[in-house]
């Protein structure tokens, strides 16, 4: 079977600063030199793209400057960080990996990571 398997953690809790990190690991059926990683958010049956980056194997992956994601790659493993999260962003975040080059193309979709985001309590007013 030449399908591509993608593994990611089931649950992650965002930090109080609204930052969540998780590892997306894929078992490559081919020798890809160009890989695209996309983070998707699934809410109900709607799927939206959160961020995407293409990288050459052996190089760092680079998200667009205005992206809420950052990441590093090592072999078939990508460490993803999503920032600026708020409680309303709690949901299922799916790691999608595509082997873009050389042909053939392969698609891999993880089962998703449920990211829980809790907004920090506002600081109480002080008289100082």
């Amino acid at each position: 079977c030449k399908a591509m398997h993608v593994a990611q953690p089931a649950v992650v809790l965002a930090s109080s600063r609204g930052i969540a990190s998780f590892v997306c690991e894929y078992a490559s059926p081919g020798k890809a030199t160009e890989v695209r990683v996309t983070v998707l958010r699934q809410a109900d049956s709607q799927v939206t793209e959160v961020c995407a980056a293409t990288y050459m194997m052996g190089n760092e992956l680079t998200f667009l400057d205005d992206s809420i994601c950052t990441g590093t790659s090592s072999g078939n493993q990508v460490n993803l960080t999503i920032q600026g999260l708020r409680a309303m962003d709690t949901g299922l975040y799916i790691c999608k990996v595509e082997l873009m080059y050389p042909p053939p193309y392969y698609l891999g979709i993880g089962n998703g990571t449920q990211i829980y985001v809790i907004d920090p309590e506002p600081c109480p007013d002080s008289d100082f």
Partner: antibody
Framework: QVQLVESGGGVVQPGRSLRLSCAAS????????MHWVRQAPGKGLEWVAV????????HYADSVKGRFTISRDNSKNTLYLQMNSLRAEDTAVYYC???????????WGQGTLVTVSS | EIVLTQSPGTLSLSPGERATLSCRAS???????LAWYQQKPGQAPRLLIY???SRATGIPDRFSGSGSGTDFTLTISRLEPEDFAVYYC?????????FGPGTKVDIK
Amino acid sequence: QVQLVESGGGVVQPGRSLRLSCAASGFTFSSYGMHWVRQAPGKGLEWVAVVWYDGNNKHYADSVKGRFTISRDNSKNTLYLQMNSLRAEDTAVYYCVRGDLLGSFDYWGQGTLVTVSS
Amino acid sequence: EIVLTQSPGTLSLSPGERATLSCRASQSVSSSYLAWYQQKPGQAPRLLIYGASSRATGIPDRFSGSGSGTDFTLTISRLEPEDFAVYYCQQYGSSPFTFGPGTKVDIK
């Protein structure tokens, strides 16, 4: 709402060329892989080619490799298929198709008929 | 290349009956990458099922998909008059993306 509208089909002689276009609207074009799928009269569906995202990566069916070129212009939200050295067996309705974020083919144009005949 | 085979080629049934369509792959296909499409004469195909079992937007719940590995099934629980059409399975996990030859569901 998502719309895909093909144009450029017609009758052409064997060995000649034709260029199909597909105007897309209602979605962020550059975030999606775009495909051409064809259907010969009375036959099933055959995937032809795909162009990904920024247009740098393309994949083709063996039956059209070296003769057809898929491309896209993200600034115009338009997909193209340049068809050279056409053969009688290329006669088909050609559909422009969006590959959704999870990979399946979720939106199809109405199709444009290409007839290769002398 | 993954070759998909569909059976039966034609299924003759009456409205209200249950339709069971089969799709078999030449090698294992992850269920995440198997779709079903419906096509009526003179129309473009329409996505019914993706990921082997998830209904596309707006698809009635009488349509359901199942299966894994090399064997997949599309079931229409009670055929409505508008369901008589040709149904194609497809794998989209690797290129070349391939379709089955189709199953025609016609009125008995």
